[in-house]
């Protein structure tokens, strides 16, 4: 019996508008009906929560209204989008998957996605 595996891309480049998207996929060892997905940012040895959402299998993924994340789910795959990123937010973003219900609980953690954010160059002033 192998432990739950979580896969995510190694590297993602954010768009010029500070939006980064990546897929988090997990191989479930059980028949979960309730799943929690958390995005964590690891900088040095500090780990902080970026956003989290719990969803019922077959239903949509819903983050809190003030969250910088949005996402959609399809089976054991979650499409995550993080918005409002700036160059200082460049770092390793880890996808954590928890099978919450029914028991037993299972934990799975991806290796992390290195998100690179480049602040856009300010537009030069133009005279008309």
């Amino acid at each position: 019996c192998k432990a739950m595996h979580v896969a995510q891309p190694a590297v993602v480049l954010a768009s010029s508008r500070g939006i980064a998207s990546f897929v988090c996929e997990y191989a479930s060892p059980g028949k979960a009906t309730e799943v929690r997905v958390t995005v964590l940012r690891q900088a040095d040895s500090q780990v902080t929560e970026v956003c989290a959402a719990t969803y019922m299998m077959g239903n949509e993924l819903t983050f809190l209204d003030d969250s910088i994340c949005t996402g959609t789910s399809s089976g054991n795959q979650v499409n995550l989008t993080i918005q409002g990123l700036r160059a200082m937010d460049t770092g390793l973003y880890i996808c954590k998957v928890e099978l919450m219900y029914p028991p037993p609980y299972y934990l799975g953690i991806g290796n992390g996605t290195q998100i690179y954010v480049i602040d856009p160059e300010p537009c030069p002033d133009s005279d008309f």
């Epitope: 309730e34 989290a52 609980y105 934990l107 953690i109």
Partner: antibody, heavy 119, light 107 residues
Framework: QVQLVESGGGVVQPGRSLRLSCAAS????????MHWVRQAPGKGLEWVAV????????HYADSVKGRFTISRDNSKNTLYLQMNSLRAEDTAVYYC????????????WGQGTLVAVSS | DIQMTQSPSSLSASVGDRVTITCRAS??????LNWYQQKPGKAPKLLIY???SLQSGVPSRFSGSGSGTDFTLTISSLQPEDFATYYC?????????FGPGTKVDIK
Amino acid sequence: QVQLVESGGGVVQPGRSLRLSCAASGFTFSSYGMHWVRQAPGKGLEWVAVIWYDGNNKHYADSVKGRFTISRDNSKNTLYLQMNSLRAEDTAVYYCARGDILTGYYGYWGQGTLVAVSS
Amino acid sequence: DIQMTQSPSSLSASVGDRVTITCRASQSISSYLNWYQQKPGKAPKLLIYAASSLQSGVPSRFSGSGSGTDFTLTISSLQPEDFATYYCQQSYSTPFTFGPGTKVDIK
């Protein structure tokens, strides 16, 4: 700094009830799974129960299922363990512990509170 | 449920000795394995998390290795303050089981 302080232990007769509390401070309480772990005199560590985040999901050891209830009040940063139908084998030091945000290890423990079930 | 076993259950060693404790899970737990040290009358203290990561403030003589089902805690040079009981624990799936412990005492 992170602090966990248990209270509510004491001597109780078999079949009676007791409620333990764990006051947490120094971190965003609602972002963490919170656990109870116990240790009978001269014995090893035994995981008792966990309650996740918003309190909707809870899991228990078979030895306490149906008798113990774990709960939390995120507005008060407090964890609880309601222990009913207590037995002599529930005699132990009870610790609350914070599960790490990433891999769930117990980086922070309370000092423990002793529950003695005796007639 | 995942069962955790530890060996040896106790050992006697001298200051300066290299000590190795093994922990085995009844099924794969990836790297979700933690090691704790406990002294009489005290709460357990985290030493190693995620199989091989040293907890902040823990001396570098402690190290952990392994993944899947087999794990090891090594103390490279035993110090007087290291005489204690050591527990492994899995944080992969409920119930979050502990090993039975290994008591390290003075030879």
